[in-house]
Amino acid sequence: EVEKTACPSGKKAREIDESLIFYKKWELEACVDAALLATQMDRVNAIPFTYEQLDVLKHKLDELYPQGYPESVIQHLGYLFLKMSPEDIRKWNVTSLETLKALLEVNKGHEMSPQVATLIDRFVKGRGQLDKDTLDTLTAFYPGYLCSLSPEELSSVPPSSIWAVRPQDLDTCDPRQLDVLYPKARLAFQNMNGSEYFVKIQSFLGGAPTEDLKALSQQNVSMDLATFMKLRTDAVLPLTVAEVQKLLGPHVEGLKAEERHRPVRDWILRQRQDDLDTLGLGLQG
C-alpha cells in the first residue's frame, strides 16, 4: 500500500484538468502542486469537484499563501470563494473592481453572507471611499447595500457617487442614514432645474431640513404622500398648512387617509383648527 503522503507513480498532476475529479482527497493533497493550482485557478470552476475536494484545494492554497492570497488567485477563485471564511478574506488586498465583481457573481441571488460583507468591507476600505463605479456594482448585486452601512461609513461616500443611487437602493435606509445622504444628494444635483431636481432628490428627502421643504413648497413639486410620510418629523412640524398644501399639490387629499400615522398625525396636532379647516378634509387637530 502506497504511503498516503506520497503521490502514487504516474499520478503527479501536470495540469489542472478533469482527470483530477477521480482523485481521492489524499491523492489531490499529494499529487497537485500548489503553485500549479495557483497559476491555473481559472480552470477549477470548469471541473465538477466535490466540496470535499475543494476543501483540499483550499488547504493547498492556504499553505502556499499563509499571509493571504494574491489578487491574481483571488480573481479566479470562483466557487472556491464559498469555502473562504471571513478570517481568510481579512488577509486579502482586493483592489480590482473586476475581482470584486467575479466574487460577487459567485454569491449572486443569495443573501449577503459574512464572507461577502467582509470582502466588500476590505475592498471599500482599500479604496478609501465608496466611488461611483463601486456603488454601481454593489447596488446591482445587493439593492439594500447602501442602507446596510452605518452613518459613519456613509460619510465616506462622495457626492459624485450619489448619481449611481436608485430609489429602491434607499428603501430600507433609516432616518439617520438619510440625514447623511441627503446633503450629498443636494450637492450632487444642485445644478439641475426644478422639476428634474425634484425627481432626483425625492428619494433622499427623508433627510431634508424644514427650510428645504419650505423652498420645495414654492416650486409646484406635487410631492406624493409616500414621500411625505418619509420626511423627518422635526422638519415637518414647523410647516404651515399653506406650505403643506403647496408642497403636496393635488396629493393633499391623501392627508385624510394618513391622519392617524406619523408624521402626519404629529403635524395635524400642532396646527390651528381654523387653518386645517381651510383644506376641507375634515382633519381634527
Epitope: D174, R176, L237, R260, G285
Partner: antibody, heavy 119, light 107 residues
Framework: QVQLQESGPGLVKPSETLSLTCTVS??????????WSWIRQPPGKGLEWIGY???????NYNPSLKSRVTISVDTSKNQFSLKLSSVTAADTAVYYC???????????WGQGTMVTVSS | DIQMTQSPSSLSASVGDRVTITCRAS??????LNWYQQKPGKAPKLLIY???SLQSGVPSRFSGSGSGTDFTLTISSLQPEDFATYYC?????????FGGGTKVEIK
C-alpha cells in the same frame, strides 16, 4: 430636568371611577414638542398604553378603552389627569404617566402608582 | 390596532454574551419603533428610539436596527445591570402598542 409624579387613590371600588393626576415639574405641560400619556401595567404583565393629551386639549385614546377613558389637561397647574370609569378587577395595575417627546418616545416616566380595584 | 410580537418571550444568558431580541409589527411602521428596559418595581426606561437612535445616556453596547415590520435590539456584551425585561413599542399609528416583553435572565 423634567419630572413626573402620579397621585390619586390606591384603592377603587368596582364600577366606580378611577381618578389620577400627573404633575409636571421642571418643564411645561404646554410644550410644543410633547404629548402626555398614561400607560398601565397589570401585576406580572406587560405595558398597555391608555391614551395621550396635547396641551391644546386634543386627545387620543386606546380603542379598547376609549368608551371609559377621559384625559384632561390643566395648563395653569401644569398637570394632566386620567379618569377611567366603570372599573373592574381587570383594571388593577400600576399606572404610569409619561412624556412622549415627538422626536423619540416615552423618554420621561413617573415612578408609577399602584391602583387596586376591590370592594 | 397594530400588533407587536416580540421573541423570545424569555432568554437565559451570561455576562459578556451577545443578546438579540426581535420585534415584528403586523404591518409596516416605517422606523417608528422604540425599545424600553424595565427592572422589577421600576418604571420603564427608553433605550432606543426611531428604530436605531440611541437615547442620551444609554451605553453604546445597546443598538437597534430594522425598518418596516422587522426590528432587532442587540446588546453586544451583556452586563450584570442588563438583566431586565425589554419591550418594543410602535408609535407610527395613533393607537400606540407595546410588544409582550422579553425577560433576560442570568444563565
Amino acid at each position: 430636568q423634567v419630572q413626573l409624579q402620579e397621585s390619586g387613590p390606591g384603592l377603587v371600588k368596582p364600577s366606580e371611577t378611577l381618578s389620577l393626576t400627573c404633575t409636571v415639574s421642571g418643564g411645561s405641560v404646554s410644550s410644543f414638542t410633547d404629548t402626555w400619556s398614561w400607560i398601565r401595567q397589570p401585576p406580572g404583565k406587560g405595558l398597555e398604553w391608555i391614551g395621550y393629551i396635547y396641551y391644546s386639549g386634543s386627545t387620543n385614546y386606546n380603542p379598547s378603552l376609549k368608551s371609559r377613558v377621559t384625559i384632561s389637561v390643566d395648563t395653569s397647574k401644569n398637570q394632566f389627569s386620567l379618569k377611567l370609569s366603570s372599573v373592574t378587577a381587570a383594571d388593577t395595575a400600576v399606572y404610569y404617566c409619561a412624556r412622549d417627546f415627538v422626536l423619540s418616545g416615552f423618554d420621561i416616566w413617573g415612578q408609577g402608582t399602584m391602583v387596586t380595584v376591590s370592594s | 390596532d397594530i400588533q407587536m410580537t416580540q421573541s423570545p418571550s424569555s432568554l437565559s444568558a451570561s455576562v459578556g454574551d451577545r443578546v438579540t431580541i426581535t420585534c415584528r409589527a403586523s404591518q409596516s411602521i416605517s422606523s417608528y419603533l422604540n425599545w424600553y428596559q424595565q427592572k422589577p418595581g421600576k418604571a420603564p426606561k427608553l433605550l432606543i428610539y426611531a428604530a436605531s437612535s440611541l437615547q442620551s445616556g444609554v451605553p453604546s453596547r445597546f443598538s437597534g436596527s430594522g425598518s418596516g415590520t422587522d426590528f432587532t435590539l442587540t446588546i453586544s456584551s451583556l452586563q450584570p445591570e442588563d438583566f431586565a425585561t425589554y419591550y418594543c413599542q410602535q408609535s407610527y399609528d395613533a393607537s400606540y402598542t407595546f410588544g409582550g416583553g422579553t425577560k433576560v435572565e442570568i444563565k
